[in-house]
């Protein structure tokens, strides 16, 4: 089953997020991803935990998963590099770098997204954009076209309340509000974009979606700049 969903969002403007990737398993959407360099897509490590012996590929330049689009192209994966400290039992270090079989053909609909290198928290209340092809309602309807939602960043202290995530949100993670509008594990690996810069990656831990007391959790990319640079080097 695909990991993740966007609840309470709307259809994105076609090809307005040229960095958006669909990580696919055996030809079906599995997770979101974000193009961070010509030959590299950033996603979530847990996405591939159940990939078993399947064929992992990356779809770039897509709005619709099923319809032909001139900019769409499916790339094989040369290398999957999970963060060395990612573990099956935790949401920490939930990052994965996928090296495409060749450099992506760039254009208006396919373009890497600059990612945050300055290791500073995004100000609470900042509106950030999250997009994905995850299911759009609790009945499990899967969208064919890319969806997105704007979410305000939530401060870590609130997110760490006992009634919320009870101290699980480390300095390397961030939260966004989840009151009916939310990302969830089917959108795992997708980008949280604030002010046109990649700030977070949707984690793929299991949690209730759309419940304001269980905010969305995102891995802060700035906290992993050294690792990302070392892999991309």
């Amino acid at each position: 089953p695909p990991r993740g969903r966007i609840l309470g969002g709307r259809e994105a403007e076609a090809h307005a997020r040229p960095y958006m990737a669909s990580v696919q398993l055996n030809g079906a959407h599995l997770c979101g991803g974000v193009l961070v360099a010509e030959q590299w897509v950033l996603s979530a490590a847990h996405c591939l935990e159940d990939a078993a012996d399947g064929k992992v590929q990356v779809l770039l330049g897509a709005h619709s998963l099923s319809q032909p689009e001139p900019s769409k192209r499916l790339y094989d994966v040369l290398r999957a590099v999970p963060h060395p400290d990612s573990q099956p039992d935790t949401i920490d270090h939930d990052l994965l770098l996928l090296q495409l079989s060749e450099k992506a053909t760039l254009g208006p609909a396919v373009r890497p997204l600059p990612w945050q290198r300055v290791d500073r928290d995004v100000a609470p209340g900042t509106l950030c954009d999250v997009a994905g092809w995850g299911i759009v309602n609790h009945a499990g309807r899967r969208p064919d076209s890319l969806q997105h939602v704007l979410l305000p960043v939530l401060d870590r202290a609130t997110c760490n309340r006992r009634t919320h995530h009870d101290g699980a949100i480390t300095e390397r993670l961030m939260c966004a509000e989840s009151n009916r509008r939310d990302s969830c594990k089917g959108d795992s690996g997708g980008p949280l974009v604030c002010g046109g810069v990649l700030e977070g990656v949707v984690t793929s831990g299991s949690r209730v979606c759309g419940n304001r007391k269980k905010p969305g959790i995102y891995t802060r990319v700035a906290s992993y700049a050294a690792w990302i640079d070392s892999v991309l080097a």
């Epitope: 055996n26 490590a45 591939l48 990939a51 012996d53 399947g54 064929k55 040369l78 290398r79 590099v81």
Partner: antibody, heavy 120, light 112 residues
Framework: EVQLVESGGGLVQPKGSLKLSCAAS????????MNWVRQAPGKGLEWVAR??????????YYADSVKDRFTISRDDSESMLYLQMNNLKTEDTAMYYC???????????WGTGTTVTVSS | DVLMTQTPLSLPVSLGDQASISCRSS???????????LEWYLQKPGQSPKLLIY???NRFSGVPDRFSGSGSGTDFTLKISRVEAEDLGVYYC?????????FGGGTKLEIK
């Protein structure tokens, strides 16, 4: 519950044949690569064979010690893994484990094993 | 074939002690995809083996954090920070980077 149950072991004479089976349940068998790993009495572990999934053309790999004598196969419709063992030798005497192969890791689920004894 | 050599063969420890097991490969076990498929398994008496560590240093699901893996290239180590009674058994290193896949000969962790 994820489970692997081996069967088909027993006593067989040298140069004889035996077919081991492994019934898988609790997971999408058809998406996983599968392996046989064996352990001779009082000895260590030895990887025997691996078969990949349909999406990887059911590619097979073997340890040098069993190549051309053993054949690994699978029936995805029945969630079954097999090991056909021909021209058996006394050194093939071992506990044979059916083992699931993950994506980030190799042997994450093991069966309880079936014993093969090759003796005259 | 890649030969995996484990030392020591037997490791007598007192409960609460730290234990360290070494595994050396006869050649580099960096896979062509850039990953190092070095794993550690524990086989308790009368049981099937269980995965502890994958890709050198990652703990598998449910494995206590007293277990840690390290190393690179051809030299790898498994450490148990405070040995408990349930840790006793035979530990095997394994390489999955090159076919045929190979296990180390095993290290028996026992009470001193």
């Amino acid at each position: 519950e994820v489970q692997l149950v081996e069967s088909g072991g027993g006593l067989v004479q040298p140069k004889g044949s035996l077919k081991l089976s492994c019934a898988a349940s609790g997971f999408s068998f058809n998406t996983y690569a599968m392996n046989w790993v064996r352990q001779a009495p009082g000895k260590g572990l030895e990887w025997v064979a691996r078969i990949r999934s349909k999406s990887n053309n059911y590619a097979t790999y073997y340890a040098d010690s069993v190549k051309d004598r053993f054949t690994i196969s699978r029936d995805d419709s029945e969630s079954m893994l097999y090991l056909q063992m021909n021209n058996l030798k006394t050194e093939d005497t071992a506990m044979y484990y059916c083992v699931r192969h993950g994506y980030y890791w190799y042997f994450d689920v093991w069966g309880t094993g079936t014993t093969v004894t090759v003796s005259s | 074939d890649v030969l995996m050599t484990q030392t020591p063969l037997s490791l007598p420890v007192s409960l609460g002690d730290q234990a360290s097991i070494s595994c050396r490969s006869s050649q580099s076990i960096v896979h062509s995809d850039g990953n190092t498929y070095l794993e550690w398994y524990l086989q308790k008496p009368g049981q099937s083996p269980k995965l502890l560590i994958y890709r050198v240093s990652n703990r598998f699901s449910g494995v206590p954090d007293r277990f840690s893996g390290s190393g690179s290239g051809t030299d790898f180590t498994l450490k148990i920070s405070r040995v408990e009674a349930e840790d006793l058994g035979v530990y095997y290193c394994f390489q999955g980077s090159h076919v045929p896949y190979t296990f180390g000969g095993g290290t028996k962790l026992e009470i001193k």
